[in-house]
Interface confidence: medium
């Protein structure tokens, strides 16, 4: 089902998209991810907000928690205990950073239909979760971790040194949350809940970013965040494990850091429980080209954790950084020592490998000039993963099953031919033992979610097919989309072009380049979207193009690592190269070309505008990075090394937007930033503006008071309206 191909015989009933459609979210779609609670059961929140339990095998469903109970505490989320005796209800959601938030939690006893009274949870809580078995609770309050054996019991305090902005227990600090884990939590139950592992982050020596939050008080508040910029002091991390059955007996035991990692600054990257008495930790040197996976065992005699050198596996990159965006996580097999993991093969493509003893002896499971993207599940006889192998389109995702019980292993594409026109980009969600799974298709047609049998792959039912959206789009003139590639100097540049509904190759159209371009990103994807650029093509007659150049992901290490230690060079060159190729196609008005981007895309759009090529008439940068010295250490150093004389300071200095201030003289530039951006600090745009003023270069700017990196709420409407006016003016389009 491709909405762009929906034709209505009554052409006059068809209308173009409006900006209002986009801002109101008129054409948004739904997905259905089952909240699995067993091999054959899942929970789902119904349209009327009841929490319903579905049993696939019996076909029965019943409400386990009524909307009345939810409403009684204004709950916006819930969590069922594994023993099904209790539900936590989450309310008073208060967002902090990208993933973190605080909330108030109430525990509802399903056996008597009442809220648990006595020893209530403190508020607000930073993180709360059930144990994987039974109904133990672990939670983080004021940066300390607490444990309850049962919801009504008094809590046992595990840590005592937690302090705001200084010591974080069980939750990450800003940089670990955004750039390393990336989660709101930093604690992990062992499979049966015997042990609880947690991270402690010490931010005492980290420099603090401070910015004003204006609010509506007489004096603005100052927000302080320990935020390590490139080259600055980093958080010090330690990992502890406590026996939750007898937490006071030995107390938390620290897991040792591998010697080769501990010899200099390092990061903890993830923790994976293998069994109740075996845990796997991943560590990374600050210079992020060496990662160590360490498998540790519980020693009963000492009540401590032993991480022998023989169980340390090193992953090293000689051409770039370790991993893709993150170092991949292991998926352990049933023997509890061997595992599957995605890393680069000898040809420089990310593939699944099976590691039994050493990384050197790893058995390669997938291979080819494409990449394995994610391992979803390993069972006794199958491994499910996603890749972009099918028909050699890097922007697609299909789900595959490899039989690992038989030799040689056989491979089957589960999704390739299911709804080929409609669905070329999938993810999956598996029940226990992969008895059943849900497929969620994101496009290129209207998204659809379906339920499947884990043994036969047979479709059982449609969970969500977005019928209302399909009907609503019947009288909309959607733009046409095409995904193609350019071959330039041994580099393949994939692009997506969004064309006006009545596109005519013999006419000339204004061109807008939308760019992100960050390392290990991908913009050219076969997904459905009705968004701002859809409107610009549908109503305003623009051609919009997205190009994946050097530094982008899932096409091999040669393309990915091309930008290593040289951010801001090839990403920009490749956008410019693509624009020249688009002009050669004959339907682009070369006097009306613009570029825009957000975040990393704002950095690239700024550099492209200041490239001195004369290609761009105008452009927009939203919340751009302007110097890599201003951005987070973990992200920046992964790709750029350190801003020191003996490392890469020279390129840090050469790659700033400010250094090119003079070159903005002949373009129309719109610079936009939120003043409360905790991620890409307002400082970045402030420095661009200062450099432009000092160079006496005219430009336009818009700030959004008290808005963060997402520019959400009413700011979103204002932002897109403002950018629309700017582009229409640039392209001489009537309002």
């Amino acid at each position: 089902l491709r909405p762009s191909r929906v034709h209505n015989s009554e052409e006059n009933t068809m209308r173009a998209l409006t900006l209002k459609d986009i801002l109101n979210g008129t054409f948004s779609y739904k997905t259905f991810f089952p909240n699995w609670i067993s091999g054959q059961e899942y929970l789902h929140q119904s349209a009327d907000n009841n929490i319903v339990l579905y049993n696939i095998e019996t076909g029965q469903s019943y409400t386990i928690l009524s909307n009345r109970t939810m409403k009684s505490v204004n709950a916006s989320n819930y969590g069922l205990s594994p023993d099904r005796q209790f539900v936590y209800l989450e309310s008073d959601y208060s967002k902090l950073w990208r993933y973190s938030y605080t909330a108030t939690y109430y525990i509802y006893d399903l056996s008597n239909g009442e809220f648990v009274r006595g020893n209530e949870l403190p508020r607000p809580i930073q993180y709360l979760c059930w144990s994987p078995v039974g109904s133990k609770l672990a939670y983080v309050y004021q940066n300390n971790i607490y444990l309850k054996q049962r919801p009504g019991d008094p809590p046992f305090q595990i840590t005592f040194n937690g302090r705001e902005n200084k010591i974080f227990n069980g939750i990450p600090d800003w940089v670990y949350e955004e750039e390393m884990l990336p989660t709101k939590y930093a604690l992990w139950w062992s499979p049966n809940g015997k042990f609880l592992a947690y991270a402690e982050f010490n931010d005492k020596d980290i420099p603090v970013i401070a910015y004003s939050y204006y609010g509506d008080e007489q004096y603005p508040r100052t927000i302080n965040i320990p935020y390590p910029k490139a080259g600055a002091k980093n958080p010090v991390v330690r990992i502890f494990i406590i026996d939750t059955t007898y937490p006071a007996y030995v107390g938390p035991q620290e897991v040792p850091v591998p010697a080769m990692i501990a010899s200099s600054d390092y990061y903890f990257s993830w923790l994976t429980w293998v069994t109740d008495e075996r845990v796997c930790l991943q560590w990374l040197k600050r210079v992020q080209n060496v990662s160590v996976l360490s498998i540790c065992d519980f020693r009963e005699d000492w009540q401590t954790w032993d991480c022998p050198k023989t169980q340390e596996h090193i992953e090293e990159s000689r051409t770039g950084w370790a991993g893709g965006f993150f170092v991949s996580r292991p998926v352990f097999s049933y023997d509890a020592i061997s595992y599957y993991k995605i890393f680069s093969d000898k040809d420089g493509y990310k593939h699944i490998h099976y590691i039994k003893d050493t990384v050197e002896n790893a058995i390669q499971i997938t291979s080819g000039k494409w990449e394995a993207i994610n391992i979803f599940r390993v069972t006794q006889d199958s491994l499910f993963y996603s890749s972009n192998e099918f028909e050699e389109y890097p922007g697609r995702r299909n789900i595959y099953r490899i039989s690992i019980g038989s030799y040689p292993p056989s491979k089957k594409c589960v999704t390739c031919h299911l709804r080929k026109e409609r669905c070329q980009y999938y993810t999956a969600s598996f029940s226990d033992y992969a008895k059943y799974y849900a497929l969620v298709c994101y496009g290129p047609g209207i998204p659809i979610s379906t339920l499947h049998d884990g043994r036969t792959d047979q479709e059982i039912k449609i969970l969500e097919e977005n019928k209302e959206l399909e009907n609503a789009l019947k009288n909309i003139q959607l733009p046409k989309e095409e995904i193609k590639k350019l071959e330039v100097d041994e580099i393949t540049l994939w692009y997506k072009m969004i064309l006006p509904p009545q596109f005519d190759r013999s006419k000339k159209y204004p061109l807008l380049i939308q760019v992100y371009g960050g390392p290990c990103s991908q913009s050219v994807r076969s997904v459905f979207a009705v968004n701002w650029i859809s409107y610009l093509a549908s109503k305003e007659g623009m051609v919009i193009a997205l190009v994946d150049g050097r530094g982008t992901a899932f096409q091999g290490d040669k393309l990915l690592y091309a930008v290593y230690r040289k951010l801001g060079v090839y990403e920009v060159e490749d956008q410019i190269t693509a624009v020249r190729k688009f002009i050669e196609m004959g339907f682009i008005d070369e006097k009306r070309i613009a570029i825009w981007g957000w975040s990393y895309g704002g950095y690239v759009s700024s550099l492209a505008l200041a490239s001195g090529t004369g290609l761009f008439k105008c452009g927009i940068a939203v919340a751009p990075v302007s110097s890599w010295e201003y951005y987070a250490s973990v992200y920046t150093e992964r790709f750029m090394g350190l801003p020191t004389k003996d490392d890469n300071l020279e390129h840090y200095k050469n790659s700033t937007v400010m250094a090119r201030a003079e070159y903005f003289r002949n373009v129309d530039y719109l610079l936009i930033h939120g003043t409360a951006d905790d991620n890409v600090h307002f400082q970045n745009s402030a420095q661009i503006a200062k450099a432009l003023v000092n160079a006496q270069v005219d430009f336009q700017a818009m700030w959004y008071s008290d808005q963060n990196h997402g520019l959400s709420g009413l700011s979103t409407n204002h932002l897109y309206t403002h950018m629309t006016h700017f582009l229409k003016q640039c392209f001489s389009l009537s309002d």
């Epitope: 040194n161 006071a248 005699d301």
Partner: antibody, heavy 120, light 109 residues
Framework: EVQLLESGGGLVQPGGSLRLSCAAS????????MSWVRQAPGKGLEWVSA????????YYADSVKGRFTISRDNSKNTLYLQMNSLRAEDTAVYYC?????????????WGRGTLVTVSS | EIVLTQSPGTLSLSPGERATLSCRAS???????LAWYQQKPGQAPRLLIY???SRATGIPDRFSGSGSGTDFTLTISRLEPEDFAVYYC??????????FGQGTKVDIK
């Protein structure tokens, strides 16, 4: 800077008692297991006792089991060794040592020691 | 109980020479759990090597550790005047919690 300062040593008669203290500074005391190690005059090093960071777990060498008690006060950043039923063979310099972590690993910092002499 | 035996008892060498100290365990010790310490007269011991081969912070690279199983070695590539001292190996991997070797004295020839 990590510092460990032992005190409480001295001359005591066989069968007597003594309490050693070790004042710690320069690190988060409660996050580390601690030990006592002794060295008899002209002899080698002998581990005596260890305690976990929380104080919930204690261990002793066979030679002192039942006579010595290790403890800690995390609010005061202080480690203790209560020595009862002292014998002549307990005569030694007693060192307080910090382990590398809460778990039972090598000693990365040592105090200067306090001399205990058991003699009649 | 694991017993650590160090040899030789005394090693007489001149500055600039190479020193090789041996530590043998009565049963296998995880290399993750073997350390070496240096002690000078009237001073507390100082950590040199942990995990059999990892140098502690601030230890010069002329000190190196190696070995696995039951045989471990501490090597001082070129003796400096300040290196003349007693060296102890220690295991911290099984009950009893810690065991030290009896020590090797490195003195000036």
């Amino acid at each position: 800077e990590v510092q460990l300062l032992e005190s409480g040593g001295g001359l005591v008669q066989p069968g007597g008692s003594l309490r050693l203290s070790c004042a710690a500074s320069g690190f988060t005391f409660s996050s580390y297991a601690m030990s006592w190690v002794r060295q008899a005059p002209g002899k080698g090093l002998e581990w005596v006792s260890a305690i976990s960071g929380s104080g919930g777990s204690t261990y002793y060498a066979d030679s002192v089991k039942g006579r010595f008690t290790i403890s800690r006060d995390n609010s005061k950043n202080t480690l203790y060794l209560q020595m009862n039923s002292l014998r002549a063979e307990d005569t030694a310099v007693y060192y307080c040592a910090k382990t590398h972590s809460t778990s039972w690993y090598y000693f990365d910092y040592w105090g200067r020691g306090t001399l205990v002499t058991v003699s009649s | 109980e694991i017993v650590l035996t160090q040899s030789p008892g005394t090693l007489s060498l001149s500055p600039g020479e190479r020193a090789t100290l041996s530590c043998r365990a009565s049963q296998s010790v995880s290399s993750s759990y073997l350390a070496w310490y240096q002690q000078k007269p009237g001073q507390a011991p100082r950590l040199l090597i942990y995990g059999a081969s990892s140098r502690a912070t601030g230890i010069p690279d002329r000190f190196s550790g190696s070995g696995s199983g039951t045989d471990f070695t501490l090597t001082i590539s070129r003796l400096e005047p300040e290196d003349f001292a007693v060296y102890y190996c220690q295991q911290y991997g099984s009950s009893p919690r810690y065991t030290f070797g009896q020590g090797t004295k490195v003195d000036i020839k």
